[in-house]
Structure formats: C-alpha cells, structure tokens
C-alpha cells in the first residue's frame, strides 16, 4: 500500500516520490474538474 510522509506532502509510491497535494500553481490538472490554462 502507498505510504505517506504527511510532514512533507510527498507520497512514496512504487519507490518514486510524487508530490500529491499539488499547490494552486500546478498546471497539470491535479485538481479534479479544475479548468487549467487554455484549451489546447
């Protein structure tokens, strides 16, 4: 199962560090349903 480092906000997932709770500035669409950038 996934293991979390709550103090850093990073998730240890399959030996890779992935920042899960991205900040408002993320432009990858981490927030479900939030319109990001323009239509491309």
């Amino acid at each position: 199962d996934a293991e979390f480092r709550h103090d850093s906000g990073y998730e240890v997932h399959h030996q890779k560090l992935v920042f899960f709770a991205e900040d408002v500035g993320s432009n990858k669409g981490a927030i479900i349903g939030l319109m990001v950038g323009g239509v491309v």
């Epitope: 996934a2 979390f4 709550h6 103090d7 906000g9 998730e11 890779k16 992935v18 899960f20 709770a21 900040d23 408002v24 990858k28 669409g29 981490a30 927030i31 479900i32 349903g33 939030l34 319109m35 990001v36 950038g37 239509v39 491309v40």
Partner: antibody
Framework: QVQLVQSGAEVKEPGASVKVSCKGS????????VHWLRQLPEKGLEWIGR????????IYTPKFQDKATLTVDTSTDTAYMELSSLRSEDTAVYYC?????WGQGTLVTVSS | DIVMTQSPLSNPVTPGEPASISCRSS???????????LYWYLQKPGQSPQLLIY???HLASGVPDRFSSSGSGTDFTLKISRVEAEDVGVYYC????????FGQGTKVEIK
Amino acid sequence: QVQLVQSGAEVKEPGASVKVSCKGSGFNIKTYYVHWLRQLPEKGLEWIGRIDPENGETIYTPKFQDKATLTVDTSTDTAYMELSSLRSEDTAVYYCVSSGYWGQGTLVTVSS
Amino acid sequence: DIVMTQSPLSNPVTPGEPASISCRSSKSLLHRNGITYLYWYLQKPGQSPQLLIYQMSHLASGVPDRFSSSGSGTDFTLKISRVEAEDVGVYYCAQNLELWTFGQGTKVEIK
C-alpha cells in the same frame, strides 16, 4: 466544442474484464492528468486513480491497485481504464476527468 | 484513509433563503504550506459532477459568488447565500491531502 466522450454502457459477467475509453474532442489529452472516478448506484464518488499522459505515470487508490489499469493513447487523444476480475460490486457509473472537463459517464453493469 | 463526513444527508431549502452544508474530515487538511486541501463538488440531477470550490475557499471558474466555503483544519461549511432552483443536486466535499476521498453527499432539494 471541447468535451470528453466516453464509450457506451457495458454489461459483463462476473470475472470478466472491461475497457472503458475516454476520447478528447477538441482537446489535447496529453496536456493534463486524466482522473478516473466511479459512482456506485445511489452512492457517492470514489476516486480510482489518475494518469499523466505525458509519461504514463499512474497513481491509484490502494483498493483499485489490482483492479484498474489506466493507459493513454496520445495519438488518438484517448484515455482508457481497464477493470479486471469484475464483481457485482463493480457495477457503477465510471467517469473520466481532465482539466475542467468531465466525461458523460459510462455505466458498467456486472451481472450473471 | 481520510474519512469525510457530511451533514445533513438531506437538506430541503427555500428559494431565496440561505443554506449551509457541513463537512468534517478525520484528519486536518491544513498542510504546513498553508493550503487546506478541501473541495466541494455539485452533481446536478442527470449530470456529471462539477467543481464548485477548491482548496477550501477558492471559487472555481463560472461558479456564482453566492457560494462560499470556510472552515478550520477539520470542520468545513459550504454556504449558499440565496438558494436558486438551479442549485438543487447532491453536494460532495472531498480532500486530496492524501489521494482523494469524498463525503457521502448531501442532497439539496427545494421544499
């Protein structure tokens, strides 16, 4: 018109697999994460996982780790979610989401 | 898993009147970076869900300003200043501090 169009409803027997597609229309699907969620009948929402179409990296909710497989074909702007070893409890409407766009939902019914 | 608990599960409302929905998380959603990872979604009848509020207090694009959200690290409230007929549906709170989990939903209907 920009939209995500999902494949049609499916009826499967227990133990079978199903592959649901989510095609971007007027939308380059490789730009943003594609999330998949499900909604059980008369129930709330469950997040299955997400895929980064740029590199294929996935994150799953632990309970779906061995149930769902997320993939993307960037050449056709289509994301896929395959569900294996289907059980009656997997009967649900499945949604894909990317940026601010939601698919219309795909009903998967598992019944013998 | 972080458990999200909503109340009430059903909320009959009167058009033009205010309404509120509560949500509680089993763990604080306030990260040390200052962001609270709490979200509100609305699923209107026969439609896919839509995002209303992200990171506790930010209104999503196109969402009317009669919607607002506030709270602490574990207790949150969605407020509608004046309910309109188009606001009916099921409201879900959600968190993504650790993956994503959703509340069980609150059905808002006109009295």
